[in-house]
Interface confidence: medium
C-alpha cells in the first residue's frame, strides 16, 4: 500500500481554482526527491503536468504551481482557471519516474450553474441555519409574505405570514420582521439538511404587483480535513461545532458504508476497540471539544465525523465536522509490545519510546481511566513526583538521547492491571498505550531480599542481600534508593562477574548493600534490580526502618537528604569496607510551575511547556556490592 495520501475526490467549478495537498512519510529521501502531478490516460500511462524539478506542461502554463513543504512532509499543487477539460483522474506522487509512490486523485470540474440574474446565493454547512432576507415595497406591507421552494413544476410553500408551515419545516422555519422596518421580512431555517438545498422564491403580495426574490440555497457537507498519522502514533480530532450546540452531548463516529458508528460520546458510550486508548475532552463553553486516540492501528484509518446532539448519536440536520485519517505503516515509532504481563508481587519494566530529537522533553506515565469521558492522571514524570499511592514501587528512568525511557512498577497487585500511556510534553504523536495484565503468582519471585523485615539500628552496620537466580548471572545487578523523584542507583561493583565460572550455584548468587553507619536518613524504600545496558529488568523492593539503639518507636522520615555511607562487600569484615565519598547531589528545585496542569492528560499534556532536567538523583550516596560463590573443577 502506497504511503502517499491526499484528497480522493476534488470537485470545483469552471473558472475557479483548486489547491491539492499530498502527504508523504517523514524521511530525508522523501523530502528531497522529485514530487509530481500527472494525469492518467486510458492506457494507464500517467503524463506529467508539473513536477518539483521545474517541469511545467503547456496546458498548465501560467496557471499552476507545485510547492514542496519538507517541514510538513507535504507538497501542494495549485491549479487556476479550471475548465471542464480538467476533469479526470490524476496522481500526486514521489520518485524519479511516474511509477513511483503515488495517490489517486479524481478531479471533477462542473459548469457554473445557470441562475436567474437577480438570484441571491446562500452557502451553508449541514446542520447550520440560514436567514433569508426578503425585501418588498411599502405598498405590499399589509399583504401576505411567503417563502416557497421550487420543484420541477411548481413552488411548494415552506412558510407564510399566516403561520402555515410545510410539515418538513415544522420547528425549523420562522418568518419574522425586525423592529419597525416595513420593507424586509426574514425567513430563518435551522438544522439544514441536503434536502433543503435548492431554489426558493420569497414573495410579498399577490398578482403582478407582488415583490419576488430568487434565492439559491447551497447546503454543503463539510470537506473532510486530511490527517496523516504514523502507525502506533496518536491523533487528535479538534472539533469546533459552534456555540449553538455547546450544551448538547458530543460524539465522534467512524463512517461504515451508510452509517456512522459512534466510537465515543460524552454520555459514556465507547467502542471496545478503542478501550484504553481514547479520551474525549471538552475544550470550552463554545462547543469545542477534542478526541485523542493513541496507539493507532492500520484498521483505524477511515472517515471520521464529530457532531453534537442530545442523544450523543449522529442526527440529520445537526452540525458536523469530518476527517479522513490515513495511517502510514512506514512508521518512525518503534514497534513495542502493546501488552506487558506481570504477576502479583512481581514487577514490570516498561520501555516508553519518545522522539529522539526531543531528548530534553519531560517524560510522563499516566493511567488511563475509562470513567466519564476518560482521563489519564499522571502517576510519575521527570518532574512530576510519584503519586502517593505508588510510594516505593514506581519510578521513571530517563535515558537521554536513545529515544527510550523506562517506567518500573513493582509490588504488583491485580488492581494494577489496566491501560497506561507513555507521553512527553514534546511531540504528541509519540504517545503510546500499554496494557498491563497482572496474573496471580504461581511460583517464588526471581529476586528475594533478606532479611525481609528490615529494621536497621541507628549508628550500627546493616546489610541486606538480594538473591537472584543463575539466569540473571550475566546481567548487571544494582541497588537503588527510592524517592518520589526517582530511584537513585547506588554505585556498585560486581566481584563475581570478573571471575571465570564453570557452574552456577543457584543458592549463592547475591548482591548486597551495607549501610555503615546507619543514619536516620537511610530510612525508606530500596530496590534491588537487574539490567542489561540500558534495558531494565526485574526489581524487588524493601522498606528499611531505622530505630534508636534503645529500640524506641520507629519514626518514618520522608526527607531524603544527602547521607554518608560506608560499604561492605558481602562476607568481608566490616572494617575493610570501602569508604565512599559523600555525594553532594544538588536536589532539583523543580521549575515545574504548571505541575497541576500536567497531572491529567485529559487536558493535553503536550501543551505544558515547563522545562528542566530529570530530578532522579535524590542525593543519596550508597554503594552496593555483588559476591558470587564459584565451584572450581
Amino acid at each position: 500500500k502506497s504511503p502517499i495520501f491526499g484528497p480522493q475526490e476534488v470537485s470545483s467549478i469552471e473558472g475557479d481554482s483548486v489547491s491539492i495537498t499530498c502527504y508523504y512519510p517523514d524521511t530525508s529521501v522523501n523530502r528531497h526527491t522529485r514530487k509530481y502531478w500527472c494525469r492518467q490516460g486510458a492506457s494507464g500511462m500517467c503524463t506529467t503536468l508539473i513536477s518539483s524539478n521545474g517541469y511545467l506542461s503547456k496546458e498548465y502554463s501560467g496557471r499552476a504551481n507545485l510547492i514542496n513543504f519538507p517541514e510538513n512532509n507535504t507538497f501542494v499543487i495549485n491549479i487556476e482557471q479550471l475548465t471542464q477539460d480538467d476533469t479526470g483522474s490524476y496522481k500526486c506522487g514521489l520518485g524519479t519516474s511516474n511509477r513511483g509512490l503515488s495517490f489517486d486523485v479524481s478531479l471533477e470540474v462542473s459548469q457554473v450553474p445557470e441562475l436567474p440574474s437577480d438570484t441571491h446565493v446562500y452557502t451553508k454547512d449541514i446542520g447550520r441555519n440560514v436567514t433569508i432576507e426578503c425585501p418588498f415595497k411599502r405598498e405590499n406591507a399589509p399583504s401576505k409574505k411567503s417563502l416557497c421552494k421550487k420543484t420541477n413544476q411548481s413552488c411548494e410553500l415552506v412558510i407564510d405570514s399566516t403561520e402555515k408551515v410545510n410539515p418538513s419545516y415544522i420547528g425549523r422555519a420562522k418568518l419574522f420582521m425586525k423592529g419597525t422596518d416595513l420593507t424586509v421580512f426574514y425567513v430563518n431555517i435551522s438544522h439544514l439538511t441536503h434536502n433543503d438545498a435548492g431554489l426558493y422564491i420569497c414573495q410579498a403580495g399577490e398578482g403582478p404587483s407582488a415583490d419576488k426574490k430568487n434565492v439559491d440555497l447551497q447546503v454543503l457537507a463539510p470537506e473532510p480535513e486530511l490527517l496523516y498519522k504514523d502507525l502506533r502514533s496518536s491523533v487528535t480530532f479538534e472539533c469546533d461545532l459552534g456555540r449553538e450546540v455547546a450544551n448538547e452531548a458530543k460524539y465522534l463516529c467512524r463512517m461504515n458504508k451508510e452509517t456512522c458508528d459512534v466510537i465515543i460520546n460524552t454520555l459514556g458510550k465507547r467502542d471496545p476497540d478503542f478501550e484504553g486508548r481514547i479520551l474525549i475532552t471538552p475544550k470550552d463553553d463554545n462547543g469545542r471539544f477534542s478526541v485523542l486516540i493513541t496507539g493507532l492501528r492500520k484498521e483505524d484509518a477511515g472517515h471520521y465525523q464529530c457532531g453534537a446532539h442530545s442523544s450523543g448519536l449522529p442526527q440529520e440536520g445537526w452540525p458536523i465536522q469530518t476527517w479522513q485519517l490515513f495511517v502510514n505503516e512506514e512508521s518512525t515509532i518503534p514497534n513495542r509490545r502493546s501488552v506487558v504481563k506481570g504477576v502479583t508481587g512481581g514487577s514490570v519494566a516498561i520501555a516508553c519510546p519518545y522522539n529522539p530529537k526531543e531528548s530534553s522533553s519531560l517524560k510522563y506515565w499516566c493511567r488511563w481511566e475509562g470513567d466519564g469521558n476518560g482521563h489519564c492522571p499522571v502517576l510519575v514524570g521527570t518532574q512530576a513526583q510519584v503519586q502517593e499511592e505508588y510510594e516505593g514501587r514506581l519510578a521513571l528512568f530517563d535515558q537521554p538521547g536513545n529515544g527510550t525511557y523506562t517506567v518500573i512498577l513493582n509490588q504488583l497487585t491485580t488492581e494494577d492491571a489496566g491501560f497506561y500511556w507513555c507521553l512527553t510534553n514534546g511531540d504528541s504523536r509519540w504517545r503510546t498505550t500499554i496494557e498491563l495484565q497482572v496474573a496471580e503468582a504461581t511460583r517464588e519471585p526471581n529476586l528475594e531480599v533478606t532479611p525481609q523485615n528490615a529494621t536497621a539500628v541507628l549508628g550500627e552496620t546493616f546489610t541486606v542481600s538480594c538473591h537472584y537466580p543463575c539466569k540473571f548471572y550475566s546481567q548487571e545487578k544494582y541497588w537503588c534508593k527510592w524517592s518520589n523523584k526517582g530511584c537513585h542507583i547506588l554505585p556498585s561493583h560486581d566481584e563475581g562477574a570478573r571471575q571465570s565460572s564453570v557452574s552456577c550455584d543457584q543458592s549463592s548468587q547475591l548482591v548486597s548493600m551495607t549501610l555503615n553507619p546507619v543514619s536516620k536518613e537511610d530510612e525508606g524504600w530500596y530496590w534491588c534490580g537487574v539490567k542489561q545496558g540500558q534495558t531494565y529488568g526485574e526489581t524487588t523492593a524493601i522498606y528499611i526502618a531505622v530505630e534508636e539503639r534503645t529500640r524506641g518507636s520507629s519514626h518514618v522520615n520522608p526527607t531524603d537528604a544527602n547521607a554518608r555511607a560506608k560499604v561492605a562487600l558481602e562476607e568481608e569484615v566490616v572494617d575493610s569496607s570501602i569508604s565512599e565519598k559523600e555525594n553532594k547531589a544538588i536536589p532539583n528545585p523543580g521549575p515545574f510551575a504548571n505541575e497541576r496542569e500536567i497531572q491529567n492528560v485529559g487536558d493535553q499534556a503536550q501543551e505544558n511547556r515547563a522545562s528542566g532536567d530529570a530530578g532522579s538523583a535524590d542525593g543519596q550516596s550508597r554503594s552496593s556490592s555483588s559476591k558470587h560463590h564459584h565451584h572450581h573443577h
Epitope: I13, V76, E80, D125, L220, L226
Partner: nanobody, 127 residues
Amino acid sequence: QVQLVESGGGLVQAGGSLRLSCAASGRSFSSYNMGWFRQAPGKERDLVAVVTWSGGGTSYADSVKGRFTIARDNANARLYLEMTSLKPEDTAIYYCAATQDWYGGTRAFRAASFHSWGQGTQVTVSS
C-alpha cells in the same frame, strides 16, 4: 503554518472608507489562498471575500459586491481589503484567514475551509 496579523480597523461614519491590511509571516505566502471574514456580535463568522494563491481569482459575498475589493501582494506577504461606501451593518470584527487546501466553488464561502486565522480587527460604522 502561516501567522497572520490584521490592522487598519477603526471607527468610521456611514458612507466612509477603510483599508484593512493583513501581514503574513512564515513560508510561501504565495501558496496560500486567502480570505477576509467578519463576525458581528451574536452572529456566525461569514466570508466577505477570497483571493486565490496567485491573485488570479476573487470572490465576494453578495452584501459587499461593488463596495469591497480584496487584493494581495505576494512579494511583501500582505493581504488587503479596500472597503468603501460603508454601512452600519458592516460593523464587525474582521478576520484574515489562510488555507492551502482549496476546492473552490461554493466551498470558498466556508470558514471551515480555512486553517490559519488572525486575531481580528474591529470595524465600527456609525450612522
